[in-house]
Interface confidence: low
């Protein structure tokens, strides 16, 4: 019968011929009376056989990632009679893996959005690298992830590539971060190959800023002839948040005379001071009122940022009008 061991050939071998092993018939007594032949895809071009001994050689550099298995056929013939000594037999040559492929991130570019002020441990995104080497061959395709840029605000789980927040971030200071992740094969051991990817992490706004008046004092004037409902001026607060988190409502905090009102222009986010009751220069020629401003939408968990609404003082001078 046929005698052989499992055949393996390492990929990327640079030698012109690499001895893989020997196949022989147990009837072969070594007197060169048998001829061995190799048939099938790769026979003669990739692999050759020593017709007398049955020794098999690889004569080309092989790439396991291109082809990991060769199925060939062997024949052994008695030279004297030209007859087959053994039935034709199929055998396999496996290409064994070396660590010749670096990890690659296939889903680039990565981009994620996470709310500002998110607590430590918040999941941001998972990045995944793949390695074309053989996952069953040692550690050639076993990856470890690490953070090259982004400390101390982000961390990455070494085995999963899950990126998490490791420190609070404020969108009003910086609204996006470039994080660089490295994947290393060989679980980081010597000879490891690596690949990197960038992750753009954008912070979405939360309502962590209260509106604050631009001025601590506003001076306005109103004619004593002005009818009720007249707009006598505007006041303005600013809010470092954006979108609906910067929408605000103005109101009167103090007006003993109950002469004025404030309405909010939600287009411009200005407060419009309105005359609620007619004024009389001869009766009272100036007024002092206090206004306050608050955000329109404040979730319960963010109320801690909105204690003590911002206030401003408004001095209103009444202009005299000649009366008939």
């Amino acid at each position: 019968g046929w005698v052989w061991n499992q055949f393996f050939v390492p990929e990327e071998m640079n030698t012109t011929s690499h001895h893989i092993g020997q196949l022989r018939s147990d009837l072969d007594n070594g007197n060169n009376s048998f001829q061995y032949k190799l048939l099938g895809a790769g026979a003669g071009s990739t692999f050759i056989i020593d017709e007398r001994t049955g020794d098999i050689y690889a004569i080309q550099k092989l790439d396991r990632e291109e082809r990991s298995l060769y199925i060939l056929r062997a024949q052994v013939i008695d030279i004297a009679t030209g007859r087959a000594v053994e039935p034709e037999s199929e055998f396999v040559i496996k290409v064994s893996d070396i660590n010749d492929n670096e990890p690659k991130f296939l889903d680039e570019p990565y981009e994620a959005i996470v709310p500002e002020m998110s607590p430590e441990g918040t999941l941001v995104i998972q990045v995944t690298a793949s390695d074309a080497d053989d996952p069953s061959s040692g550690n050639n395709a076993r990856l470890l992830y690490s953070l090259l840029q982004g400390q101390p605000y982000f961390s990455v789980e070494p085995t999963t590539g899950v990126i998490r927040i490791s420190s609070k971030m404020d969108r009003e200071l910086q609204d996006e971060y470039w994080v660089i992740i490295q994947a290393k094969d060989m679980i980081g051991q010597p000879g490891a190959l690596s690949g990197t990817t960038s992750v753009l992490i954008k912070l979405s706004d939360v309502n962590d800023n209260k509106p604050i008046f631009k001025e601590s004092l506003y001076r306005l004037t109103v004619s004593e002839s002005a009818p009720t409902g007249t707009s006598i001026g505007t006041i303005m607060a600013y809010d470092n948040d954006i979108g609906e988190n910067a929408e605000m409502d103005y109101s009167i905090e103090e007006d003993d005379s109950q002469t004025f009102d404030i309405i909010t222009n939600h287009e411009t986010q200005e407060g419009i001071v309105i005359l609620k009751k007619k004024v009389d220069f001869e009766h009272q020629n100036h007024y002092g009122i206090r206004a306050k401003v608050k955000n329109h939408h404040v979730p319960e968990q963010l109320m801690k940022y909105h204690t003590e609404a911002s206030t401003t003082f408004i001095k209103i001078q009444v202009e005299d009008v000649d009366e008939p």
């Epitope: 607590p119 430590e120 400390q151 101390p152 605000y153 420190s167 609070k168 971030m169 404020d170 009003e172 200071l173 910086q174 609204d175 971060y177 800023n209 470092n240 940022y305």
Partner: antibody
Amino acid sequence: QVQLQESGPGLVKPSETLSLTCTVSGGSISSYSWSWIRQPPGKGLEWIGYIYYSGSTNYNPSLKSRVTISLDTSKNQFSLKLSSVTAADTAVYYCARNWAFHFDYWGQGTLVTVSS
Amino acid sequence: QSVLTQPPSVSGAPGQRVTISCTGSSSNIGTGYDVHWYQQLPGTAPKLLIYGNSNRPSGVPDRFSGSKSGTSASLAITGLQAEDEADYYCQSYESSLSGWVFGGGTRLTVL
């Protein structure tokens, strides 16, 4: 490598406005936040305020009524104005870049003396 | 009066280990905001020494280390060298001010 350089007059009269400019090189100002910090002679550091590249600002409440920080992206510069100065405003003024909650690059500082 | 409290001075002999403490409150360090440390050599601008409680920028020797617990933080310097003689400042973010605060600074003297 990002570098910051403060410039402006070294002497300002009381009640006048102190004006300083910080020029950023080796990187664009159109990212990050940019701060001013000062240090009176022999004393500690005090944060004055910052401007974000979008233009939004935040100031130290103790100085807020007198401070304005502005940005000129075309020149890669940001500026500090501090009005109604007194001798207590005499200090070395530093500009710095914020990386989120800390300052990773600083200018070398410029001494401003308030005196008549 | 600084929001973050540091000892005014510490000292140590060459080769020794010294620590500098930085005590804050529930509105800064205790809220979860990081502590950062700066070294200011005489006549120069402050230089970032430790960021995010315990991270060293490239170029900073591993003799310098930082830690944080509760409302306080500390900077440790091992194998003290003459060139470590400087002022050291801690810094954090103060939520009640919506801005940054520094400690009063600690002068390190190498004996």
